[in-house]
């Protein structure tokens, strides 16, 4: 099996943003995600 | 873009309570999330509290939940914060800010405009 290793020489932050869920539907209360690299994964 | 101007800061001694209002003009307020955020000297501005455009929907800072209370009034474009069982470390300068409808609410960013800020100070 290959072997793959992170060792990019850079720290890559996360950041949890939160987004009201009726910007987006109907539904109420806020939705939770988690920005890693710039990229929203969750 | 909407104008955004803080009151009700002041002196209160630890466990007391305030509350805060921030006044908007412009037409468009109720399509923008609002949120209150602190600034205690030398630190960076943090979040504290957000309130959907509508009113419906609320989300807290771990460190005031439970204690503080974010409201807003779409007839009389303002939103407030009652904040109770105040303490020292609730010191800061606050702000009221609008975000567009869409953005992260708990990041400084999101925000486009910003009132001047009013001054807690909780006295031990």
């Known amino acids: 099996d290959a072997e793959f290793r992170h060792d990019s020489g850079y720290e890559v932050h996360h950041q949890k943003l939160v987004f009201f869920a009726e910007d987006v539907g109907s539904n109420k209360g806020a939705i939770i995600g988690l920005m890693v690299g710039g990229v929203v994964i969750a | 873009e909407v104008q955004l101007v803080e009151s009700g800061g002041g002196l209160v001694q630890a466990g007391g309570s305030l509350r805060l209002s921030c006044a908007a003009s412009?037409?468009?307020?109720?399509?923008?999330?609002m949120g209150w955020f602190r600034q205690a000297p030398g630190k960076e501005r943090e979040f504290v509290a957000a309130?959907?455009?509508?009113?419906?929907?609320?989300y807290y800072a771990d460190s005031v939940k439970g204690r503080f209370t974010i409201s807003r009034d779409n007839a009389k474009n303002a939103v407030y914060l009652q904040m109770n069982s105040l303490k020292p470390e609730d010191t800061a300068i606050y702000y009221c800010?609008?975000?567009?409808?869409?953005?992260?609410?708990?990041?400084?960013?999101?925000?486009?405009?910003w009132g001047q800020g009013t001054q807690v100070t909780v006295s031990s």
């Open positions: 800010g609008a975000a567009y409808r869409g953005t992260a609410i708990n990041v400084r960013r999101s925000y486009d405009s």
């Open positions: 412009g037409r468009t307020f109720n399509n923008y999330n």
């Open positions: 309130v959907s455009r509508s009113g419906v929907s609320t």
